[in-house]
């Protein structure tokens, strides 16, 4: 069964700057990745970035840089200033649309006791929805 993992890290240099990394553990080809915060995409969450392997990347503030790390993982850096800045308990969700397997989504947040610059290792987060 495919799995999605989510890792959230607060940058040591900018305490309100976050890096989100997500990956897909499955055999299908990824057709689209959607990163959101505040809950799953389409269920109250707000889209931060959409990554398409062929057509490029779209991102919305406070997202600063979204990119592919590998063919099955992505990273997203969030700006740390302004009213729309994330906070320590913000939930981030990644939805991977995979062909032909369907859509798989998982969410994660900053580990409660993590020091700035540290994070839990990327482990598969609970899969919230498989369409």
């Amino acid at each position: 069964t495919p799995e999605v993992w989510v890792q959230v890290r607060m940058e040591a240099t900018e305490l309100s700057s976050f890096t989100i990394r997500c990956g897909f553990l499955g055999s299908g080809s990824i057709s689209l990745v959607t990163v959101s915060w505040g809950g799953p995409n389409g269920a109250g969450g707000t889209t931060l970035a959409v990554l398409h392997p062929e057509r490029g990347i779209r991102q919305w503030a406070p997202a600063r840089q979204a990119r592919w790390e590998t063919q099955s993982s992505i990273s997203l850096i969030l700006e740390g200033s302004g009213a729309s800045s994330p906070c320590a308990n913000t939930t981030f969700c990644c939805k991977f649309a995979s062909f032909p397997e369907g859509s798989w989504e998982a969410c994660g947040s900053l580990p409660p006791s993590s020091d700035p610059g540290l994070s839990a290792p990327p482990t598969p987060a609970p899969i919230l929805r498989a369409d």
């Epitope: 080809s29 057709s31 062929e54 057509r55 490029g56 779209r58 991102q59 919305w60 062909f99």
Partner: antibody, heavy 117, light 107 residues
Framework: EVQLVESGGGLVQPGGSLRLSCAAS????????MHWVRQAPGKGLEWVSD???????YYLGSVKGRFTISRENAKNSLYLQMNSLRAGDTAVYYC????FGYGMDVWGQGTTVTVSS | DIQMTQSPSSLSASVGDRVTITCRAS??????LGWYQQKPGKAPKRLIY???SLQSGVPSRFSGSGSGTEFTLTISSLQPEDFATYYC?????????FGGGTKVEIK
């Protein structure tokens, strides 16, 4: 109600210029890619250009360097500046919305561009 | 560029007929394909997205199937308002490309 309304079409001589506009309403404009698609008289549909939410642009090869797509998110507006127009650019031009990666879903009614001497 | 070859280019059918239109892509496009209906003097309207998902508000007599390079639009029981031209569109890669269209006429 989601709505796209094009304007700016008309008759222009070969080599001339025209600027098309599209006014969007009923949705959060900045969240969507916006496209121009055209249809020559009696012919099929042809994609022309796409602009991403932050201004990333893509063009059909035959219009690259002549057409410029742009958007003003604050005004919910999309534009197509067409220069060095040719007879082959004669068509109805449609403004179209796309939730990026999911395909075009909402179309305007179209505006007619005629390039003729 | 990805070429989309649609067939037939036209067909004649009667009300109640089952109609099938095919679109072939020159390379695999997963399921990044939509089907559109256009009536004379009107803008196209999306019927199907993601190759097989029915657009909200579209009658269930329309269905889409296929993936990779071969796709089908089926109208299970043709109605008078279905006489129109139908197009497929691939949105996997730039330039986005449409099929040449299929005109469905009254027999």
């Amino acid at each position: 109600e989601v709505q796209l309304v094009e304007s700016g079409g008309g008759l222009v001589q070969p080599g001339g210029s025209l600027r098309l506009s599209c006014a969007a309403s009923g949705f959060t404009f900045r969240n969507y890619d916006m496209h121009w698609v055209r249809q020559a008289p009696g012919k099929g549909l042809e994609w022309v250009s796409d602009i991403g939410n932050s201004g990333e642009t893509y063009y059909l090869g035959s219009v690259k360097g002549r057409f410029t797509i742009s958007r003003e998110n604050a005004k919910n507006s999309l534009y197509l500046q067409m220069n060095s127009l040719r007879a082959g650019d004669t068509a109805v031009y449609y403004c179209v919305r796309e939730e990026f990666g999911y395909g075009m879903d909402v179309w305007g009614q179209g505006t007619t561009v005629t390039v003729s001497s | 560029d990805i070429q989309m070859t649609q067939s037939p280019s036209s067909l004649s059918a009667s009300v109640g007929d089952r109609v099938t239109i095919t679109c072939r892509a020159s390379q695999g496009i997963r399921n990044d394909l939509g089907w559109y209906q256009q009536k004379p003097g009107k803008a196209p309207k999306r019927l199907i997205y993601a190759a097989s998902s029915l657009q909200s508000g579209v009658p269930s007599r329309f269905s889409g199937s296929g993936s990779g390079t071969e796709f089908t639009l089926t109208i299970s029981s043709l109605q008078p308002e279905d006489f129109a031209t139908y197009y497929c569109l691939q949105h996997l890669n730039y330039p986005l490309t449409f099929g040449g269209g299929t005109k469905v006429e009254i027999k």
